[in-house]
């Protein structure tokens, strides 16, 4: 009996036309939502003038439906048993699941000012930037609508730069009508233990953002894993959002709509400093902000973001070192709300429920030559927003799963 089930599972999880896995893989049957909480700065004047702690108040959720588009350019390669595809991006605002509208205003760090002052450190260039910042009446902080902040706005300061630069700024700009990839993943035809594991991303086996093993593209995209998952496994996956591969470990058994699943979580060790977790040495890319690689819980992804000083963390700086959150008031990290987890059905390896949580932060540094930054006495890793991307298997699909998979085994 068990052998027959194993054989059936192996057949059905292959990523090729006609299998259950393929149908759900091309276009997810699960509704996926991305909730945003924006950190509204309460004391912009005090920060800019006196280098005070930044007082933030989160506002949200503002919810978008995402991942509703089918994979594009799906191409099987029989020679190396891979399938390649693009994952199109799309986001639709869901007013009924949101606390306000896309026109809501927020006081946030001026993204262009923070980024430009970081990218162009030459003193003479900074003097020019200063005059353009002042001329455009730009400041350290700005008021932007949710739509502008997420999806892009024309920046008045960048619009004055006398040589060609992208004048549109947004945390997720460009997003709609773009695609992530090309991904090339193993389809599992020759070896089921490799199914969904990424072979190449954008034509490469490495990212070119990190040194050594940190630069590797490991595992799947976390939507599924090879079948027959064991609790002892460390599940590796790659996330283009954070420009790195990461891993999850077993935490507990969970019952999801009558289906036994394994809850895997991202452990705090994955965010630790090299002092505590030597494997993380290659995620420490500079010595000053990281305090000689002793800070933890924030990931400098500037190399992946054209030099813009973007730092990724868990929401509210969960699992981050005290020095990171010390200059920010109003954060309340807690594991239940702010950690990432994957609920995996162990027989098929399918992720039936997940919550991916991350926070986008921007570094801003004092600058003698830029007036709106010259009163700062310290560096700040400024939280801009955090997001919670969730998906849960629908009731209908769960029934089908119970009858066809778990029901047959028990």
């Amino acid at each position: 009996g068990d052998l027959l089930i194993q054989k059936t599972i192996k057949k059905q999880v292959v990523l090729e036309e006609g299998t259950i896995a393929f149908k759900n893989w091309v276009k997810t049957g699960t509704e996926v939502y991305r909730q945003f909480w924006i950190f509204d700065v309460q004391n912009p004047q005090e920060v800019m003038m006196n280098s005070s702690n930044i007082q933030v108040k989160q506002r949200g959720p503002y919810t978008y439906r995402v991942r509703f588009l089918a994979k594009e350019n799906v191409t099987q390669d029989a020679e190396d048993n891979t399938v390649s595809f693009l994952q199109p991006n799309g986001a639709i605002f869901e007013p009924s699941l949101s606390v306000g509208t896309e026109a809501d205003n927020f006081t946030v760090l001026n993204l262009a000012v923070a980024a430009a002052s970081h990218i162009y450190q030459n003193q003479f260039v900074q003097m020019i930037l200063n005059s353009l910042i002042n001329k455009s009446k730009s400041s350290m902080f700005q008021v932007r609508t949710l739509r502008e902040l997420l999806w892009g706005y024309r920046d008045p300061f960048l619009s004055l730069v006398p040589y060609p630069v992208t004048t549109t700024v947004g945390l997720f700009y460009p997003y709609n009508n773009t695609a992530d990839g090309v991904y090339k993943v193993f389809n599992g035809k020759d070896n089921i233990s490799k199914v969904a594991i990424i072979d190449t991303y954008k034509g490469k086996r490495n990212l070119s953002y990190w040194e050594s093993h940190c630069d590797m593209i490991n595992g799947t995209d976390a939507a599924s894993f090879p079948p027959f998952v064991e609790k002892s496994q460390v599940l590796q996956f790659f996330s283009s959002d954070i420009c790195r591969s990461i891993y999850a470990v077993f935490e507990s058994d969970v019952n999801l709509k009558g289906i036994p699943v394994y809850r895997f979580v991202l452990p705090s060790k994955a965010f630790a400093s090299p002092v505590e977790n030597p494997d993380n040495y290659c995620f420490c890319t500079e010595k000053i902000i990281s305090k000689n690689c002793t800070s933890y819980g924030v990931l400098d992804i500037s190399k992946c973001k054209e030099g813009r000083p973007v730092y990724i963390s868990l929401p509210h700086f969960l699992y981050a070192s005290p020095d990171v959150s010390e200059p920010i008031d109003g954060l309340n990290p807690n594991e239940e709300e702010h950690r990432t987890y994957l609920d995996i059905e162990p027989i098929t390896g399918f992720t039936l429920q997940f919550a991916k949580r991350l926070q986008v932060n921007l570094l801003v540094k004092p600058s003698e030559k830029i007036q709106v930054l010259k009163n700062l006495k310290r560096n700040y890793i400024v939280p801009i927003l955090w997001l919670n991307e969730t998906g849960t298997i629908g009731d209908e699909k769960a029934n089908m799963f119970r009858s066809q998979v778990t029901g047959k085994i028990n």
Epitope: Q45, T107, S139, M140
Partner: nanobody, 126 residues
């Protein structure tokens, strides 16, 4: 003609009070953020207080916090600066300035301001 005019300056003893006015003509002040600056002899002009146009938010430099108060009377198209507990180091020429279109006024960058008054002298001396 667009104009800002300060008044109310003068000679006052340490510990005394003065109320400066900044009256606008040729434009409506309630659409503008208003800043007060001062320039002491031999020193650079410094921003001391402003009131934003959008939400009436105020900001005071540490040197005047708790002693000076800014307010606006839109009906009279005038902004006031009430100065209490004056000290000799408050001696300076006081200027008001108006900035349109900046709902995020978070500092005293002179280039932000579209219109300036001529200034009024404040002398604090016994």
């Amino acid at each position: 003609q667009v104009q800002l005019q300060e008044s109310g300056g003068g000679l006052v003893q340490p510990g005394g009070s003065l109320r400066l006015s900044c009256a606008a003509s040729g434009f409506t002040l309630d659409y503008y953020a208003i800043g007060w600056f001062r320039q002491a002899p031999g020193k650079e002009r410094e921003g001391i207080v402003y009131i934003s146009n959008s939400d009436g938010n105020t900001y005071y430099a540490d040197s005047v916090k708790g002693r000076f108060t800014i307010s606006r009377d839109n009906a009279k198209n005038t902004v006031y600066l009430q100065m209490n507990s004056l000290k000799p180091e408050d001696t300076a020429v006081y200027y008001c300035a108006a900035d349109q279109g900046s709902s995020v006024m978070h500092g005293f960058i002179e280039e932000w301001y579209d219109y300036w008054g001529q200034g009024t002298q404040v002398t604090v001396s016994s």
